[in-house]
Interface confidence: medium
């Protein structure tokens, strides 16, 4: 028994040295169909949902998933590059909303609202939910009416 566990340990250390385990250790696996970027998993869903239904659907996938927060240029551009491989014309709900309807935007997952990437004329009216705008290759956000049905992006930390 001891020799078998020793052999397993040796095998694991060899795999780690050859880099086979390297990616596993550094890069946890995401749910099938989700993509990984810097400690997070993202799921892009081309189903039409209003903002709150999209958030509920993200939560239903478990793992603490929510509509995605986008916290840096690197994260924004990596997501944009990924989505553009599928489509370039439909806006996509993200986890930014204005629940008090006072232009006090916050991320639904509780992340700090520091990075901002609003497109020019994006505020005002009855638009209290944020989408990634297809007008600028998904790199900027616009506000929209929360009952609009559109694609959405979920995110969780594995």
């Amino acid at each position: 028994m001891a020799s078998r566990s020793m052999r397993l340990l040796l095998l694991l250390s060899c795999l780690a040295k050859t880099g086979v385990l390297g990616d596993i250790i550094m890069r946890p696996s995401c749910a099938p169909g989700w993509f990984y970027h810097k400690s997070n998993c993202y799921g892009y869903f081309r189903k039409l949902r209003n903002w709150s239904d999209a958030e509920l659907e993200c939560q239903s996938y478990g793992n603490g998933a929510h509509l995605a927060s986008i916290l840096s240029l690197k994260e924004a551009s990596t997501i944009a590059e990924y989505i553009s491989g599928y489509q370039r014309s439909q806006p996509i709900w993200i986890g930014l909303h204005d629940p008090q309807k006072r232009q006090q935007w916050q991320w639904i997952d509780g992340a700090m609202y520091l990075y901002r990437s609003w497109s020019g004329k994006s505020m005002g009216g009855n638009k209290h939910c944020a989408e990634m705008s297809s007008n600028n290759n998904f790199l900027t956000w616009s506000s929209n009416e929360c009952n609009k049905r559109q694609h959405f992006l979920c995110k969780y930390r594995p």
Partner: antibody
């Protein structure tokens, strides 16, 4: 194996601009990004910016913002670096380098284009 | 201005082992992986290590990389005359929103 073929050496006057090209040979830029890196004589490597080939969206290092333009011509598989208002300290070898995806490591490099700025 | 600091020079006799350090910050190496490049003057730089520890195919096992906190290091064992070159670390910097290179280390094989 994809190679990056760069345009030839240039001599420019201060205040003018230069356009350096980088063409994919034996491959395509479609899903990769192309970075520009320069090295002035006796200095280290310096990242200038990147373009996402499939989006055509460029990003620039803060120190080059406004003076540098990176563009791509998908039809010819060529990426361009345009540096305006040249100064003598822009004299350098300019390299293009491919990354398989945006913000990933530069796995294939061009041989470099020497740009000399002199009056 | 580089935000990754390397020793300007390193040296070793053939067969020896040499370690080149790369010191960064929380927003660079502290948050992102490190890449290492070998640059022989007059040639195109060559990728040696990516994702801090991974070797591309064709790079000998004598080259290895590691990181700890806000620093990275490149280890070259069994030093050979062909290893003489400038070595650069690089990483994405979250506060600068772009890549930064190290100051570079000139390796001399004695």
């Amino acid at each position: 194996q994809m190679q990056l073929v760069q345009s030839g050496a240039e001599v420019k006057k201060p205040g003018s601009s230069v356009k350096v090209s980088c063409k994919a040979s034996g491959g395509t830029f479609s899903s990769s990004s192309i970075n520009w890196v320069r090295q002035a004589p006796g200095q280290g490597l310096e990242w200038m910016g990147v373009i996402i080939s499939n989006l055509g969206t460029p990003y620039y290092a803060q120190s080059f913002q406004g003076r540098v333009t990176i563009s791509a011509d998908k039809s010819t598989g060529t990426v361009y670096l345009d540096v305006s208002s040249l100064r003598s300290d822009d004299s350098a070898t300019y390299y293009c380098a491919r990354a398989r995806r945006l913000w990933q490591t530069f796995d294939i490099w061009g041989k470099g284009t020497l740009v000399t700025v002199s009056s | 201005q580089s935000v990754l600091t390397q020793p300007p020079s390193a040296s070793g006799a053939p067969g020896q082992r040499v370690v080149i350090s790369c010191s960064g910050s929380t927003s660079s190496i502290g948050s992102n992986t490190v890449n290492w490049y070998k640059h022989v003057p007059g040639e195109a730089p060559k990728l040696l290590i990516y994702s801090s520890t991974q070797r591309p195919s064709g790079v000998p096992g004598r080259f290895s990389g590691s990181t700890s906190g806000t620093s990275g290091s490149l280890t070259i064992s069994g030093l050979q005359s062909g290893d003489e070159a400038d070595y650069y670390c690089a990483a994405f910097d979250d506060s600068l929103n772009g890549f930064v290179f190290g100051t570079g280390t000139k390796l001399t094989v004695l």
